[in-house]
Structures are given as C-alpha cells and as structure tokens.
C-alpha cells in the first residue's frame, strides 16, 4: 500500500543536519521502519515484543535514530547537495495484525543556508 506524500513536516533542519520524521499510528505496537533514499535503504529500526512482552529494539543499518510512541526520527548529518533526493518512510506493521506495509515520503531540498560548513 502506498500512501504517498507525508501529510506532516517530514524534514526538520538543525545545525547542518536534518531530522527525518517517520510517523506511525499510536495503535501500532510492533513494526519495522526503514528510511529509503530513492530505492536504497539508509536506516532501519525494528521494535518487537517477545512472548513475555519484553521489548526489543534493533537496527540493522546503523543510523542515529530516536523512537517515540508514534514516530521514529532518523538523523542525517553534514548535509551537502548530494543529500537532495526523495526520502521515504517504509513502515511494516507486525502488530496489530494483519501485516501491512505503508510508504510515505517527500523530497528533501537542500538550500545553502542549511549546509553544514559553507565556504565564505
């Protein structure tokens, strides 16, 4: 299922970096969230629970990430023009069932004012 464009502010710039916000519904308890740049997996974070309700968080691709109860934020640093691209949040929902995949995204525009280290 493709949801298309994110209906929220997906990119938050600060200190020469960008926070990419990937939201998921409050009801979702177990999931995998992948950050795609074009078709390439940049980052991922998986939250699951074991048979005794113990929570496990794992990242296969290491990125600085932050988990809240309705979003995953991925952080990219040292921005340059090569970061300009379409970015997608690919959400796989394990729980509650049924299994479902949603894709939301947007284009990351890079302006001179957002670059880390401008040459004077």
């Amino acid at each position: 299922e493709i949801n298309g464009s994110a209906n929220y502010e997906m990119f938050i710039f600060h200190n020469g970096g960008v926070q990419i916000l990937c939201k998921y519904p409050d009801i979702v308890q177990q999931f995998k969230m992948q950050l795609l740049k074009g078709g390439q997996i940049l980052c991922d974070l998986t939250k699951t629970k074991g048979s005794g309700n113990t929570v496990s968080i794992k990242s296969l691709k290491f990125c600085h990430s932050q988990l809240s109860n309705n979003s995953v934020s991925f952080f990219l640093y040292n921005l340059d023009h090569s970061h300009a691209n379409y970015y997608f949040c690919n959400l796989s929902i394990f729980d509650p069932p049924p299994f479902k995949v949603t894709l939301t995204g947007g284009y990351l525009h890079i302006y001179e004012s957002q670059l880390c280290c401008q040459l004077k």
Epitope: I27, T48, K49, G50, N53, S56, P96
Partner: antibody, heavy 117, light 111 residues
C-alpha cells in the same frame, strides 16, 4: 513452509548436561524471537526460555534459571538450549517455538529429554 | 507470576453440540485495548496448534466454529458445533508479562 526441527534429546543421568538444537527453515529466522517450551509426560505446557532476534535479550523460567542457557546462530538458522545440572523434573518433551509477534504460531515436533539414573 | 486456571478439567460433548472452555487469569491481561490471551489446541502425539490470539482473533486457517471471547481476567473458548477432529486438549496462555504461563489444559472428548 515454516519448519522447526528439534534434536539432541535423549537419556541423561541426574546432574548431567545436554544440548538441544532447533533447525529453522522457511522464514527469515533473524526476524523472530524464539522460545523453548516443555511438556512433561501426560502434563501441560510450561514455558522455559526465550531469546530476541540478536541474542541480546534472554529470559528464563525461574525453575531453570542458572542451569539452562539459550542461544542462537542466525547464520545457521539454529536455536540452542544448553541444559546443565539436569534433574528428574526436567524430564519432558522440549519444543522449539517461533514467537510470531503475538502468539506461538509455529512449533517443532519436539525432542524427548529423560533424566534418570 | 500470573497464574492461569482452566475449567472444566475435561468435558464430553456430543457431535454437533457446543463445547465451552473457561480460562481465568490471576490478574488483568488487558493493556492498550488488547487482551494478551491465546488459545491452543493439542492433539495426542502432536505439538500445540495456534487457534486464537488477542482473546478473540482467529488464526489463519482456523475454522469459524472456534471463537474466543472475554476480557480482563475471564476468557472463553467456544466450539460451536463439535467435530470428531476437535478431540484434543485446549490450553490458554497469557503474554502480558514474563514469564508467559499456560493454563493446565482442558481435555475435550466426544460423548
């Protein structure tokens, strides 16, 4: 098709050790928590232990804590249960089970462990 | 640890009749709108088979004569029209906290 095949059971004396294996196929093993559940002859089901995707989180039933260890080799798609200081009350069929996010959705056929002198 | 109890220990029901199994937990299994309660069926010489999760959701491929209900601490598995292949032991299990525990089982036979 999901398949779980246990091996390593047998007859062992009290105080002895045994290592059970569970070979998994038909799914991405590293995506799932895995568990061991046992069943004494003619009795009910008793949870023994579980392990998360990477082996970073493990839990044990109080009755086996300090005697049993659980591990996994994701490269070999195999789950293990190392059982030390075995007692007569550990006699049971040991099942390997896949935790499918909200239930044990796949079980092996089990391997029988008999602890007796 | 949460203690799970089941009643009756066993029951015999005529073919085509309703079978009802009860499961009780020592504390509430309700969290975030979900009841962390599962039902399994185990036939002689076989491993358990998943029937119902989250107290009332049928697993894929499970016949609709099996249904689960209840909330909090009291749960029920109902077989609306018993078939010969339903002869088995039925277990409830919670996954609210560690350790997950099973009920002692209810044996269902044909009268």
């Amino acid at each position: 098709e999901v398949q779980l095949v246990e091996s390593g059971g047998g007859l062992v004396q009290p105080g002895g050790s045994l290592r059970l294996s569970c070979a998994a196929s038909g799914f991405t093993f590293s995506d799932y928590w895995m568990d061991w559940v046992r069943q004494a002859p003619g009795k009910g089901l008793v949870w023994v232990s579980n392990i998360d995707h990477d082996g970073n989180i493990i839990n044990f039933a109080p009755s086996v804590k300090g005697r049993f260890t659980i591990s996994r080799d994701n490269a070999k798609n195999t789950l293990y249960l190392q059982m030390n200081s075995l007692r007569a009350e550990d006699t049971a069929v040991y099942y390997c089970a896949r935790w499918g996010h909200y239930a044990f959705d796949s079980w092996g056929q089990g391997t029988l462990v008999t602890v007796s002198s | 640890d949460i203690v799970m109890t089941q009643s009756p220990d066993s029951l015999a029901v005529s073919l085509g009749e309703r079978a009802t199994i009860n499961c009780k937990s020592s504390q509430s299994l309700l969290s975030s709108g979900y009841n962390y309660l599962i039902w399994y069926q185990q036939k002689p010489g076989q491993p358990p088979k998943l029937l119902i999760f989250y107290a009332s959701t049928r697993h894929t491929g499970v016949p609709d004569r099996f249904s689960g209900s209840g909330s909090g601490t009291d749960f029920t598995l109902t077989i609306s029209s018993l078939q010969a292949e339903d002869v088995a032991v039925y277990y409830c299990q919670h996954h609210y906290s560690s350790p997950p525990t099973f009920g002692p089982g209810t044996k269902v036979d044909i009268k």
